[in-house]
């Protein structure tokens, strides 16, 4: 009878066991355990009869297709074999084990006691076959064993071999190369490589093997594990195997998917290709006239570019557009995308307009092109440049007109300052009661007016000022002072000043040149109390042309001593004779009270001391500081007045031959204009050049070359 | 014509803020001064400030510096003035007035608790 | 800031007559560059908003009465009503034009 076992150990033992077995028995013992284990047999005890070759009883061990052992008798002879302490082990899950005794024992015999147990295989050490061992590494457990992989790799769906993922590789640039995975090592088995090559239409691929060129092959069947195919379009190439690389391929196409397919076995060392664009070939390029083309090739093809530049001078001409540069390329049918253009002369074109100077074109037909040379010069005398600079400017190999020290900038025309029209007499009178002054003695005079629309009824009076550039007039800060503020300093409105130039006489305005206000700015340390910082400026709303009549009085350098006492200086206005008169009967035409005709006197600098103890003697605060000087005559009889403020006192300079305004009309004593001993007092402009260029917006050095020293 | 008309009177309590407002009609308003000027009742006349309307220049009395604003909106050609912290003592009639020539009808503001 | 002391506070006249009435300040309200007083007179009715009378001390607004009229300069400012007219009964007051600017006390007209 058969005995099915299916536990992990156990015993066996003969029948009768450990009595002698019965004659004519048979026993099969079938013993299954688990996949991944296999079963030891050993035998405790054997006794069995023997027989040549075990015929008559005996104990076999088998597999299902194979007999591992069989036992009998008491010890092994030639003949035949006890198990002794031989262990059995099955190759696999199962093992039989068959107990027969005959018809007759000649002897008692007591049979065998055996046992058997379950052991876990070692697939790892074990599995010698391809097609079952681990392709990278394998892990044993009891009762089984598992595949893993090296980094980069998948396990197969068999579970045993290592794959790869390389079925996204897009390719664009126009060379490139492209190998096995892994090479030049054995590539990765069970894998599907897709590689895409996707160039701009127009190129074609051209595909070349390289070095090694290893894939499993087959000599009879052509490639039936491993291959590669190479698709282009609908046409498929290959498959290619074995160990001779395919000829250069040129696909006459952009696109082309290149499939590697390897299957679960092999050690090959697979392949490596290069690809290259090709294009079609574009015609031989002329540089033009004047010009150059980069890079310079014998041969251009799809996709290269040149660009065309032209000599130092020239510019590029395209389509009527001027351009530095200009690029052509090759196009995908072998055609140019542009003709080369024409490399044109550089143009300056026409000069920029110089305020208050002219242009002279110092090459012939007034040429305007690369190289050609231009003189700016200023309009004399009234201006002068700036810098003293050439005014020469060369047209530039950018198409601008250039000069060496000012570059692309235009040059300045500054005015000309301190030079009237006309030439001064030595003989001057008083303006109270004074002499008229011809048109152009005094250029720089203005007349300011304000008139305060703000309050009803409106606020007007007048003051004088001196022109200091063709924007900006120079005055007396009480004259731009609003003046319904008792002791606060805010400027009038700029709204509400006119500032007449050129004027000679009031009555007829008609020659002058009257301008509103763009900026007032008062001396910040202004003192109403005692007029300390008497200076003010207003930037006229638009520059005034100069001419005979409209020319600009020079600043003096920056010096606290002032003019020198003794020193004669004139002063200019249309100040009142009479001081009893308002403003209303000033500005009205029908009164003679302001002097209709420019009026001047000339006035001696009066020593500091002495103007200080003339006003201390007197009762009053007042306070002669050193922001101010004294002119006049002890004796009295010519001075300033009211109207006459912020009108500049100007002194004549022998080192540069121009006028200088020293001083601005500021205030005197409380008795009537040109009383004895009552010395005008002025303002010291020249403890103020510094605030005034900076209020100017122009660096002092910019300017002072204009009075020569 | 050339007139200001205020706003009608108002009746507020210590603490609270009063906003007069003094609309200019017949003459450009940007460019002239409007003053602001106050009567208690049966008292003499007293300045409280003054605003150029084009430029929102500002003068103030220092006696209402603190508590007194004004401002001016050109595009309905309003000048307003704000007075905070009302008071019993700033019960009063304000007028608004153009540099003296022209004023306002009054507004009368009673602070009373 | 500038203080104006009226006087007398109030004046008791019969129509018909002179009145003067005083205002002086306590600085100088000369502008020499302007050549002004800025000093103004106002005439306030009951219930009514004053009216500027007189500006620059002595200078007639327009549409007021001759009559009135305006004198002095430096501090001290009179207004004169040369024959005073039922009209003319109220509060006159005077106000100086330097910022800050201030009024005076006033003075009440009243028919004697």
């Known amino acids: 009878h058969t005995v099915e076992l299916n536990n992990m150990f156990g015993q066996i033992q003969s029948p009768g066991y450990p009595d002698s077995y019965p004659s004519d028995s048979e026993v099969t013992w079938n013993i299954t355990v688990p996949d991944g284990f296999r079963i030891k047999l050993y035998f405790m005890h054997f006794n069995l009869e023997s027989s040549y070759l075990c015929e008559y009883d005996y104990v076999k061990v088998e597999t299902e297709d194979q007999v591992l052992a069989t036992f009998c008798g008491r010890e092994t002879t030639d003949t035949e074999q006890t198990p002794g302490q031989e262990v059995v082990l099955s190759p696999g899950s199962f093992m039989s084990i068959t107990f027969r005794s005959d018809f007759s024992n000649e002897e008692r015999f007591t049979g065998f006691d055996a046992h058997y147990m379950a052991v876990d295989v070692d697939e790892c050490k074990e599995r010698e076959d391809e097609e079952l061992s681990c392709d990278h590494y394998c892990h044993n457990y009891i009762g089984g064993y598992y595949c893993s992989c090296r980094f980069g790799y998948i396990l197969h769906t068999d579970n045993r071999t290592c794959r790869v993922e390389c079925s996204d590789n897009l390719f664009t640039q126009r060379t490139g190369v492209i190998t096995s995975p892994d090479f030049p090592n054995p590539y990765p088995k069970s894998s599907e490589c897709l590689y895409t090559i996707e160039l701009e239409e127009g190129f074609m691929v051209n595909l070349q093997f390289e070095d090694i060129f290893d894939i499993e092959d087959h000599p009879e069947v052509p490639c039936p594990y491993d291959y590669i195919k190479i698709k282009v379009g609908p046409k498929v190439l290959g498959p290619f195997c074995g160990e001779k690389a395919p000829e250069p391929i040129s696909t006459q196409s952009h696109s082309v998917l290149i499939l590697f397919h390897s299957d679960n076995s092999g050690e090959n060392r697979g392949w490596r290709l290069s690809y290259r664009a090709a294009g079609n070939e574009c015609p031989e390029l002329q540089p033009p006239v004047h010009g150059k083309i980069e890079p310079s090739q014998a041969k251009y093809f799809f996709k290269d570019q040149v660009l065309v530049s032209c000599d130092t001078g020239y510019k590029v001409l395209k389509d009527n557009v001027e351009m530095d540069t200009f690029q052509i390329e090759c196009l995908k049918d072998g055609t140019w995308s542009n003709k080369i253009p024409t490399c044109k002369i550089v143009d300056c074109r026409a000069p920029g307009e110089l305020e208050h100077g002219l242009i002279t074109f110092s090459t012939r037909n007034n040429l305007t092109t690369y190289k050609s040379e231009i003189k700016y010069s200023c309009q004399e005398p009234y201006y002068k440049m700036l810098n003293n600079n050439t005014g020469i400017y060369t047209c530039s190999a950018q198409g601008v007109w250039m000069n060496k020290v000012l570059g692309r900038s235009l040059p300045t025309c500054l005015p000309e300052c301190g030079q009237p029209s006309r030439s001064l007499p030595s003989l001057v009178k008083r303006i109270i009661g004074g002499r008229n002054a011809e048109p152009g003695l005094f250029p720089w005079q203005a007349l300011i007016v304000v008139e305060d629309t703000s309050r009803v009824p409106n606020d007007k009076w007048f003051g004088s000022g001196a022109l200091l550039s063709a924007s900006w007039i120079l005055t007396a800060a009480h004259v731009l002072r609003s003046q319904r503020r008792d002791t606060t300093v805010i400027p009038v409105s700029k709204e509400h000043v006119t500032v007449y130039l050129g004027l000679h006489d009031v009555r007829d305005k008609s020659g002058a040149v009257n301008s509103s206000a763009a900026r007032v700015v008062l001396h910040p340390d202004f003192n109403i109390q005692n007029y300390n910082h008497d200076i003010a400026l207003v930037q006229l709303q638009e520059p005034v042309p100069l001419g005979p009549h409209v020319m600009p009085v020079c600043l003096p350098r920056l010096e606290p001593e002032g003019p020198a006492p003794h020193m004669l200086g004139l002063v200019a206005g249309w100040g009142i004779s009479n001081p009893n008169v308002t403003v209303d009967e000033i500005i009205s035409s029908g009164t003679r009270t302001l002097s209709d005709v420019l009026q001047y006197v000339k006035l001696p600098v009066v020593p500091h001391a002495e103007c200080k103890t003339s006003y201390e003697s007197r009762s009053g605060n007042y306070s002669v500081t050193e922001n101010m000087f004294c002119a006049g005559y002890y004796e009295g009889g010519k001075d300033t007045c009211l109207g006459d403020s912020g009108g500049a006192f100007v002194i004549f300079d022998d080192l540069s031959q121009r006028w200088v305004v020293q001083g601005l009309v500021s205030w005197g004593g409380p008795e009537e204009c040109g009383s004895k001993q009552v010395y005008g007092v002025y303002t010291k402009v020249s403890n103020y050049v510094d605030w005034v260029w900076e209020q100017m917006g122009l660096p002092q050095s910019v300017v002072e070359p204009q009075v020569e020293r | 014509q050339v007139q200001l008309v205020q706003s009608g009177a108002e009746v507020k309590k210590p603490g609270a803020s009063v906003k007069v407002s003094c609309k200019a009609s017949g003459y450009t308003f940007t460019g002239k001064w409007i003053e602001w000027v106050r009567q208690a009742p049966g008292q003499g006349l007293e300045w409280i400030g003054e605003?150029?309307?084009?430029?929102?220049?500002?003068d103030y009395n220092e006696r209402f510096k603190d508590r007194a604003t004004f401002t001016a909106d050109t595009s309905t050609s309003t000048v307003y003035m704000e007075l905070s912290s009302l008071r019993s003592e700033d019960t009063a009639v304000y007028y608004c007035v153009r540099s003296e020539d022209l004023w306002g009808q009054g507004t009368l503001v009673t602070v009373s608790s | 800031e500038i203080v104006l002391t009226q006087s007398p506070a109030t004046l008791s006249v019969s129509p018909g007559e002179r009145a003067t009435l005083s205002c002086k300040s306590s600085?100088?309200?000369?502008?020499?560059?302007?050549?002004?007083?800025?000093l103004a007179w106002f005439q306030q009715k009951p219930g009514q908003s004053p009216r500027l009378l007189i500006y620059w001390a002595s200078t007639r607004e327009s549409g007021i009465p001759a009559r009135f009229s305006g004198s002095g300069s430096g501090t001290e400012f009179t207004l004169t009503i040369s024959s005073l007219q039922s009209e003319d009964f109220a509060v006159y007051y005077c106000?100086?034009?330097?910022?800050?600017?201030?009024f005076g006390g006033g003075t009440k007209v009243e028919i004697k």
């Open positions: 106000k100086q034009s330097y910022i800050p600017f201030t």
């Open positions: 605003i150029l309307p084009g430029s929102g220049s500002t």
């Open positions: 600085q100088n309200l000369f502008n020499s560059r302007t050549r002004k007083n800025y």
